[in-house]
């Protein structure tokens, strides 16, 4: 099966790599603009230069292109706790991230929020906090994991999943009491 190509991909595939087909004359292949620039005017004829202009402040192109306009720079979402890792340049978009000891939770493909890494109090770090994943904790005896925090088994209600994890502790306590009464 031949993959479906859009009109632009079809047009570009006629020309060698790094060139695109002139929109008004399909016998002419124009050189694409370098990253950091955009297409101001198509090349007038074969072997003649494409008129490319540098992106203005606040915009960029990250790869060779024949875009009529540069792309607007992204803004880091302060309300999501994001901070700017590197500012936008003519050839690279803004890079946003999280502060130290935070991880990214992606709400959707292009939207993330920064959350503090779990400290694993009353437990140990099983897997360290990473850029896109919270710390994975293992709890000490007498504690169970709830919402990635180690909670005392005294807070374990019968209906919760923690009964399985806290049961040995409860049995041990009963066993000690029984041996003490003989």
């Amino acid at each position: 099966l031949v993959p479906h190509l859009g009109d632009r991909e079809k047009r570009d595939s006629v020309c060698p790599q790094g060139k695109y087909i002139h929109p008004q004359n399909n016998s002419i292949c124009c050189t694409k603009c370098h990253k950091g620039t955009y297409l101001y005017n198509d090349c007038p004829g074969p072997g003649q230069d494409t008129d490319c202009r540098e992106c203005e402040s606040g915009s960029f192109t990250a790869s060779e292109n024949h875009l009529r306009h540069c792309l607007s720079c992204s803004k880091c979402r302060k309300e999501m706790g994001q901070v700017e890792i590197s500012s936008c340049t003519v050839d690279r978009d803004t890079v946003c991230g999280c502060r130290k000891n935070q991880y990214r939770h992606y709400w959707s493909e292009n939207l993330f929020q920064c959350f503090n890494c779990s400290l694993c109090l009353n437990g140990t770090v099983h897997l360290s906090c990473q850029e896109k994943q919270n710390t994975v904790c293992t709890c000490h005896a007498g504690f169970f994991l709830r919402e990635n925090e180690c909670v005392s088994c005294s807070n374990c209600k019968k209906s919760l999943e923690c009964t399985k994890l806290c049961l040995p502790q409860i049995e041990n306590v009963k066993g000690t009491e029984d041996s003490g009464t003989t």
């Epitope: 939770h105 709400w107 959707s108 493909e109 292009n110 939207l111 929020q113 959350f115 919402e147 990635n148």
Partner: nanobody, 120 residues
């Protein structure tokens, strides 16, 4: 077919409270983060709050932090928004939304909305 049905809106005095509900059907509710979005008269859409699949991680717009609480009951396929200390500027149509896992849009399905009017 994905369906999101909001309820609980109405007229309330400033300082009052309301609890919005959203009954979800037509998709596996437990697999998706959910959210509330609002549109005030003559204004654009504003994200209000979001909650992850297990109800652990939440997001609140600065304008509602400390006053609104989002929650979900996965056993009932229902999303909630508890709104306290309501202000006139909270007047809007509130939409329940399913958060998209892919693509550039955060939300891929919306409900019909429920009107919240804060007025004395």
């Amino acid at each position: 077919e994905v369906q999101l049905l909001e309820s609980g809106g109405g007229l309330v005095q400033p300082g009052g409270s309301l609890r919005l509900s959203c009954a979800a059907s037509g998709f596996t509710f437990t697999r998706y983060s959910m959210g509330w979005v609002r549109q005030a008269p003559g204004k654009g859409l504003e994200w209000v709050s979001m909650i992850d699949t297990r109800g652990v991680r939440t997001y609140y717009a600065d304008s509602v932090k400390g006053r609104f609480t989002i929650s979900r009951d996965n056993s009932k396929n229902t999303l909630y928004l508890q709104m306290n200390s309501l202000r006139a500027e909270d007047t809007a149509v509130y939409y329940c939304a399913k958060i998209s896992q892919f693509g550039s849009n955060a939300f891929d399905y919306w409900g019909q909305g429920t009107l919240v009017t804060v007025s004395s």
